[in-house]
């Protein structure tokens, strides 16, 4: 049961940071402007990844798209290059996961397969949010750093006696949005491969000892099992491992103590 | 028909108050943001201050600083410019304006009231 | 705060002539976001509150007789009147609409000779 909730929760956990780091990955609000001690402007400009927008005091917004590919900073091309590649792999994983759930059940697939899947999706949420946290990352490093060069320089003489107003930008939502979506994500894989190993099936140490009843022949196999993490050999009714090591004896003693599923 | 209304104006002695109004009709006035603007005599166009539609943004003149308060009251369609420590250079015609939608412009203007501080 | 400094501060032309005035802000009306300049042009005649003709340094209002166009950028903006008609007689203003406080122009002032 631990382990059904384990993989339930981390399934939606992942969802949701996904979710997240899609809905920063499109915000506009990645950087906006700085508004203290700044010259205070009749408009409020903030960008994205993939437009610039400003607000102007009626409220009338305006964006206009980086119509330019090769013109924009490898920085930022970078950063959109992590956030895209841990949206595709987190929805792959979200993919593989749907499948790999144990409340789910598709046709005759193996536990072995569903452990096996479970751990892939975990791996690739993992993968996927640590893409979105360095992506958000870069991006907020090159903001302090844009930040403390336009604080040095905060007019830029031009010609002498004409200043040009240098707009300096600060951490947007999305920045933060990113940040925790990521987090999400990460936690969310990092709890599937945790229900991976519950899922695993355990290697059986077969000890068979043959009872003898009237006229029938009965093999009972008492559990003799090993703490493994390996995907081994393919057992219908599986004990789940506690966490415990313990000997044969004390499993033989206290079945009660695990789960059946 | 959009129409801005003001009133209030007067002959006040120096160092003292008056308060100005602007009676708005023809668009939805919690909508806009709205300036005042003012124009000495023979002179230019000195703008004076400017409230947002919900009132989060107030800038003001420096040479009004401290001095007037621009308010406004959204349920009664009504801008006001409350304006205290009054000197012989706030004479003017005193112009409520509507913020435009676009390019931050001041679209509609009022017809104007005279303030005149005289001792 | 930013100076608005509008030249010439009269001129005299003929009816249908074309006419040009300046202005010139202290500092870039420029807003990178958006690639707009924050600079507005006011008609105001004799008697009568001022009235909207341009906006975004070159986007006329509507209503706006398409003889008057705005152009200009950064600091540097003009205002053209294509063909003088005696309604224009006015004193022309331009504003600073980017940052606070919003300034304007000493005015220009058309007359027809």
């Known amino acids: 049961m631990a382990v059904t909730a384990c993989q339930g929760l981390g399934f939606v956990v992942s969802l949701i940071g996904i979710a997240g780091i899609i809905a920063a990955t499109c915000m506009d609000q990645w950087s906006t402007q700085d508004l203290y001690n700044n010259p205070v402007t009749a408009v409020f400009n903030y960008q994205g990844l993939w437009r610039s927008c400003v607000r102007e005091s009626s409220g009338f917004t305006e964006c206009r798209g980086y119509f330019t590919l090769l013109g924009l900073p490898a920085m930022l091309q970078a950063v959109r290059a992590l956030m895209i590649v841990g949206i595709v792999l987190g929805a792959i994983g979200l993919l593989v996961s749907i499948f790999a759930l144990k409340c789910i059940r598709i046709g005759s697939m193996e536990d072995s397969a569903k452990a096996n899947m479970t751990l892939t999706s975990g791996i690739m949420f993992i993968v996927s949010g640590l893409c979105a946290i360095a992506g958000v990352s870069v991006f907020a490093n090159m903001l302090v750093t844009n930040f403390w060069m336009s604080t040095a320089n905060m007019y830029t003489g031009m010609g002498g006696m004409v200043q040009t107003v240098q707009t300096r930008y600060t951490f947007g939502a999305a920045l933060f949005v990113g940040w925790v979506a990521g987090g999400l994500t990460l936690i969310g894989g990092v709890m599937m491969c945790i229900a991976c190993r519950g899922l695993a099936p355990e290697e059986t140490n077969y000890k068979a000892v043959s009872y003898h009843a009237s006229g029938h022949s009965v093999a009972y196999k008492p559990g003799g099992f090993k703490a493994s993490t390996g995907f081994g050999s393919n057992t219908k009714n599986k004990k789940i491992y506690d966490g415990g090591a313990r000997t044969e004896d004390e499993v033989q003693s206290y079945p009660s103590k695990h789960d059946y599923v | 028909e959009v129409q801005l209304v003001e009133s209030g104006g007067g002959l006040v002695q120096p160092g003292g108050s008056l308060r100005l109004s602007c009676a708005v009709s023809g668009f939805t006035f919690s909508s806009f943001g709205m300036h005042w603007v003012r124009q000495a005599p023979g002179k230019g166009l000195e703008w004076v201050a400017y409230?947002?539609?919900?009132?989060?943004?107030?800038y003001y003149a420096d040479s009004v600083k401290g001095r007037f308060t621009v308010s406004r009251d959204n349920a009664k369609n009504s801008l006001y410019l409350q304006m205290n420590s009054l000197r012989a250079e706030d004479t003017a015609v005193y112009y409520c304006?509507?913020?435009?939608?676009?390019?931050?412009?001041?679209?509609?203007w009022g017809q104007g009231t005279l303030v005149t501080v005289s001792s | 705060d930013i100076v608005m400094t509008q030249s010439p501060d009269s001129l005299a032309v003929s009816l249908g002539e074309r006419v040009t005035m300046n202005c010139k802000s202290s500092?870039?009306?420029?807003?990178?976001?958006?690639?707009?300049?924050?600079l507005t042009w006011y008609q105001q005649k004799p008697g009568q509150p001022p009235k909207l003709l341009i906006y975004w340094a070159s986007t006329r209002e509507s209503g706006v007789p398409d003889r008057f166009s705005g152009s200009g950028s950064g600091t540097d903006f003009t205002l053209t009147i294509s063909s003088v008609q005696a309604e224009d007689v006015a004193v022309y203003y331009c504003q600073n609409v980017y940052i606070y406080p919003l300034t304007f122009g000493q005015g220009t002032k058309l007359e027809i000779k």
């Open positions: 304006v509507r913020s435009g939608y676009y390019g931050n412009s001041l679209d509609y």
């Open positions: 409230i947002s539609s919900g009132t989060t943004n107030i």
């Open positions: 500092q870039s009306l420029f807003n990178s976001g958006n690639q707009r300049n924050y």
